[in-house]
């Protein structure tokens, strides 16, 4: 039979290669079948018999067509600061990502070694760059004509409302207060809105981290002034 319709195992033509989903076995010197994802080579091929495949055992997997003698072990269970976004199956490894509100601060070869909490932007500052799976939030001062009155890892600086008659002028941390006539929103400089995914809580949004193999965000109004830029009541 010509090589292109040969059944495995078969000897490749001189200088030729094996077909898709086949591999060249050095011992048998034949083109032999690979095993499909979720299986591994239980018995390697010989000159007269093809590869014998077997299913991966529990907690092991193969993701690609292969001829490995043993399936790969799935990663350990996700640590407490991570959530499982893909379960371990015979065909895929477990995937862990940092919890919502956290990001991967210290990565490892596959996935995340340590997750850390995302910073938030204080009133008067808005999110310049939202947190991602692997980076912290970046804040910026609200430009003139814009404000943020929240402590949040998602809220950007928003434009002050424009009043026909201003009762209280707005500042970086407070919107303008108008007299009873209806206000309008300005499109003040610096009020460019960050593209964000669909909201998952009230009117606030969270960055949606792309998963990684093993192990990236919030809000609300202060009750009075925001915490001081010092620290302790204990001195």
């Amino acid at each position: 039979l010509p090589a292109q319709v040969a059944f495995t195992p078969y000897a490749p033509e001189p200088g030729g290669t094996c077909r898709l989903r086949e591999y060249y076995d050095q011992t048998a010197q034949m083109c032999c079948s690979k095993c499909p994802p979720g299986q591994h080579a239980k018995v390697f091929c010989t000159k007269t018999s093809d590869t014998v495949c077997d299913s991966c055992e529990d907690s092991t997997y193969t993701q690609l067509w292969n001829w490995v003698p043993e399936c790969l072990s799935c990663g350990s269970r996700c640590s407490s600061d991570q959530v499982e976004t893909q379960a371990c199956t015979r065909e895929q490894n477990r995937i862990c990502t940092c919890r919502p509100g956290w990001y991967c601060a210290l990565s490892k070869q596959e996935g995340c070694r340590l997750c850390a909490q995302l910073r938030k932007c204080r009133p008067g500052f808005g999110v310049a760059r939202p947190g991602t799976e692997t980076s912290d939030v970046v804040c910026k001062p609200c430009a003139p004509g814009t404000f943020s009155n929240t402590t949040s890892s998602t809220d950007i600086c928003r434009p002050h409302q424009i009043c026909h008659v201003v009762a209280i002028p707005g500042n970086a941390s407070m919107d303008a207060v108008c007299t009873s006539t209806s206000p309008t929103r300005s499109m003040a400089p610096g009020a460019v809105h960050l593209p964000q995914p669909v909201s998952t809580r009230s009117q606030h949004t969270q960055p949606t981290p792309a998963p990684s193999t093993a192990p990236g965000t919030s809000f609300l109004l202060p009750v009075g002034p925001s915490p001081p830029a010092e620290g302790s009541t204990g001195d």
């Epitope: 600061d81 509100g101 601060a105 202060p222 009750v223």
Partner: antibody, heavy 125, light 110 residues
Framework: EVQLVESGGGLVQPGGSLRLSCAAS????????ISWVRQAPGKGLEWVAY????????DYATWVNGRFTISLDNSKNTLYLQMNSLRAEDTAVYYC??????????????????WGQGTLVTVSS | DIQMTQSPSSLSASVGDRVTITCRAS??????LAWYQQKPGKAPKLLIY???DLASGVPSRFSGSGSGTDFTLTISSLQPEDFATYYC????????????FGGGTKVEIK
């Protein structure tokens, strides 16, 4: 003025229970993650537990072993630490501590910038 | 679990001395480290965060350096009010944490 004030400490027998409170003024706990940190007499600081209100998540030091529960009453803007099965080695000053608010506009929950004055818990028969 | 080890556990120094305290993490924590000062009967006070950034209101004689596993707190010229205990802390407190703070370094008057 922004401050945290702990209360509820006192003398309790081994095996007993106690509930500590931490009342906040000037900040809304629902925006700010907050921890309990303790310090045994003459010893160092020891992180106990953390609550992240936005996501309803809690974390505990490995040695807590389910004996303590951290919780938050948003309506009272008060943090709690319910401590059960108390042992002599739980004797300590218990502090509530919140993240650091920097002058450059960040609130960073990884570090403790705001502390209460502490409340003493003594476990003894 | 990341373990934080401080050295020395105590030291004696005089006003005007340059004082250096070290903190070693059991694994790489990049720059996620803070330093605190605590005086007897008082709550701790944040001095340095992210290994080298000075917290608001902290005198410039305090400085922090290091990354990875080895960190240093330096007081360039010790003042009378600096006699206290100093602690380092890593920024990864979660349910797999046990040791978050170092054991402390007591700075005493010589």
């Amino acid at each position: 003025e922004v401050q945290l004030v702990e209360s509820g400490g006192g003398l309790v027998q081994p095996g007993g229970s106690l509930r500590l409170s931490c009342a906040a003024s000037g900040i809304d706990f629902s925006s700010y993650g907050i921890s309990w940190v303790r310090q045994a007499p003459g010893k160092g600081l020891e992180w106990v537990a953390y609550i992240y209100p936005d996501y309803g998540s809690t974390d505990y030091a490995t040695w807590v072993n389910g004996r303590f529960t951290i919780s938050l009453d948003n309506s009272k803007n008060t943090l709690y630490l319910q401590m059960n099965s108390l042992r002599a080695e739980d004797t300590a000053v218990y502090y509530c501590a919140s993240g650091y608010a920097s002058s450059s506009g960040y609130y960073d929950p990884k570090y403790f910038g705001l502390w209460g004055q502490g409340t003493l818990v003594t476990v003894s028969s | 679990d990341i373990q934080m080890t401080q050295s020395p556990s105590s030291l004696s120094a005089s006003v005007g001395d340059r004082v250096t305290i070290t903190c070693r993490a059991s694994e790489d924590i990049e720059s996620y480290l803070a330093w605190y000062q605590q005086k007897p009967g008082k709550a701790p006070k944040l001095l340095i965060y992210d290994a080298s950034d000075l917290a608001s209101g902290v005198p410039s004689r305090f400085s922090g350096s290091g990354s990875g596993t080895d960190f240093t707190l330096t007081i360039s010229s010790l003042q009378p009010e600096d006699f206290a205990t100093y602690y380092c802390q890593h920024g990864f407190y979660t349910s797999r944490s046990d040791s978050v703070f170092g054991g402390g370094t007591k700075v005493e008057i010589k």
